[in-house]
């Protein structure tokens, strides 16, 4: 971790202890400079471990809407287009930060929250347990 | 998508227009009730589209450390353990929200920022363009 030298133009803050409340501008800055041409939104259909996207909405959360991946099959799609159960489709999960309204229903007061979301699926070799 | 009747105990806020500044408690609440036993951290090795994880650190960002996936091969690993270039390993990307210190170096003032991260890789059938 790197220590941040204080900018003299920062908003004043007396309490430097955790938990601490900070000010956040919700006007989102997009660092993804123009749409990535290599980024495809059809991988969920073309993957050997295809997935469906499910809509999850919670107005007490920011962002309110998150689309979650659910693998279509237990196995993976083989070269013939059939499901091969010798391989496993598994969700790739990521912990992300969201804002949770706190107290509830407040438009301008939040708490950081960590949630686990499934982003897509990948095909893995199963772990085989051999019984002695 | 559901709207929020104002809680009378909310911090006061006159301006409901974008952009708006809100208060955020950085004491993270973890909604992932105990670690999911099915969540495996070795998928990156067992996948037919394996990936490496690269550490990305930025002290002006919260969280300052993000681990990014980079696919190991252009192709996918076949049943013999060789790379099959008739299939493609591709990154599964997700847009996530992070906090960016604004003004820079301020410990208590942030702006929401959207960044694109690669979470893992999946094996897809390539799109073949036929030339007439």
């Amino acid at each position: 971790g790197i220590t941040i030298p204080r900018n003299p133009g920062c908003p004043n803050s007396e309490d430097k202890n955790f938990p601490r409340t900070v000010m956040v501008n919700l006007n989102i800055h997009n660092r993804n400079t123009n749409t990535n041409p290599k980024r495809s939104s059809d991988y969920y259909n073309r993957s050997t471990s295809p997935w469906n996207l499910h809509r999850n909405e919670d107005p007490e959360r920011y962002p309110s809407v998150i689309w979650e991946a659910k693998c279509r099959h237990l196995g993976c799609i083989n070269a013939d287009g059939n499901v091969d159960y010798h391989m496993n489709s598994v969700p790739i999960q990521q912990e992300i930060l969201v804002l949770r309204r706190e107290p509830p229903h407040c438009p301008n007061s939040f708490r950081l929250e960590k949630i686990l979301v499934s982003v897509g699926c990948t095909c893995v070799t199963p772990i085989v347990h051999h019984v002695a | 998508g559901i709207t929020i009747p104002r809680n009378p105990g909310c911090p006061n806020s006159e301006d409901k227009n974008f952009p708006r500044t809100v208060m955020v408690n950085l004491n993270i609440h973890n909604r992932n009730t105990n670690t999911n036993p099915k969540r495996s951290s070795d998928y990156y090795n067992r996948s037919t589209s394996p990936w490496n994880l690269h550490r990305n650190e930025d002290p002006e960002r919260y969280p300052s450390v993000i681990w990014e996936a980079k696919c190991r091969h252009l192709g996918c690993i076949n049943a013999d353990g060789n790379v099959d270039y008739h299939m493609n390993s591709v990154p599964i990307q997700q847009e996530i929200l992070v906090l960016r210190r604004e003004p820079p170096h301020c410990p208590n003032s942030f702006r929401l920022e959207k960044i694109l991260v690669s979470v893992g890789c999946t094996c897809v059938t390539p799109i073949v363009h036929h030339v007439a």
């Epitope: 919700l26 939104s41 309110s64 809407v65 689309w67 | 998508g1 559901i2 709207t3 847009e95």
Partner: antibody, heavy 121, light 106 residues
Framework: EVQLVQSGAEVKKPGSSVKVSCKAS????????IHWVRQAPGQGLEWMGV????????FYNQKFDGRVTITADKSTSTAYMELSSLRSEDTAVYYC??????????????WGQGTTVTVSS | DIQLTQSPSSLSASVGDRVTITCSAS?????IYWFQQKPGKSPKRWIY???ELASGVPSRFSGSGSGTDYTLTISSLQPEDFATYYC?????????FGQGTKLEIK
């Protein structure tokens, strides 16, 4: 200025398909879902489904029983709604509307001008 | 599906009148949305999250309610308010709208 501009009126035969477009401008296309709502002549509003241009996710009103397909093209900031196996009762004005993913309580805040689809033999 | 029933279906009133439109849900919902539509035009978001007026909506409009019963009130009717108003719920799929209340000049 936020705008959702829809394609022109269509006249279709029963059993055929129609594809309506909705071109967005004046905002970041991937920050908003696109919802589709239709209105039969002299009738109320009926929600058909949603597409998230960012993830490609879609969710449909089951009433349409697999006949509706909603897509989006991020490169042109255009959403599409295709309805197949058309019948006379699909004669309606079709609207697209945007919906902020980050704070859903704002609801469907901007709507397209509507596209009239007439199904007649 | 959650049914939304608006009352009345049509209403004749005069400029200056106080008007109330109700929307009753077949089961409890979290909030209601109201849209205004004029003939040949697209619906306009009018009231969101039960209480909040959309940008440009005059303060003579107000929204209230909870559970299954919601209302839109116009304190003093103006000529530009004559239109059809629809309530809308997003608490449960499929999202549904009321059948509409047509507000006409007496």
């Amino acid at each position: 200025e936020v705008q959702l501009v829809q394609s022109g009126a269509e006249v279709k035969k029963p059993g055929s398909s129609v594809k309506v477009s909705c071109k967005a401008s004046g905002y970041t296309f991937t920050d908003y879902e696109i919802h589709w709502v239709r209105q039969a002549p002299g009738q109320g509003l009926e929600w058909m489904g949603v597409n998230d241009p960012e993830s490609g996710g879609t969710f449909y009103n089951q009433k349409f029983d697999g006949r509706v397909t909603i897509t989006a093209d991020k490169s042109t900031s255009t959403a599409y709604m295709e309805l197949s196996s058309l019948r006379s009762e699909d004669t309606a004005v079709y609207y697209c509307a945007r919906y902020y993913r980050y704070e859903s309580f704002y609801g469907m805040d901007y709507w397209g001008q509507g596209t009239t689809v007439t199904v007649s033999s | 599906d959650i049914q939304l029933t608006q009352s009345p279906s049509s209403l004749s009133a005069s400029v200056g009148d106080r008007v109330t439109i109700t929307c009753s849900a077949s089961s409890s919902i979290s909030y209601i949305y109201w849209f205004q539509q004029k003939p040949g035009k697209s619906p306009k978001r009018w009231i969101y999250a039960t209480f909040e007026l959309a940008s440009g909506v005059p303060s003579r409009f107000s929204g209230s309610g909870s559970g299954t019963d919601y209302t839109l009130t116009i304190s003093s009717l103006q000529p530009e308010d004559f239109a059809t108003y629809y309530c809308h719920q997003r608490s449960s799929y499929p999202w549904t709208f009321g059948q509409g209340t047509k507000l006409e000049i007496k």
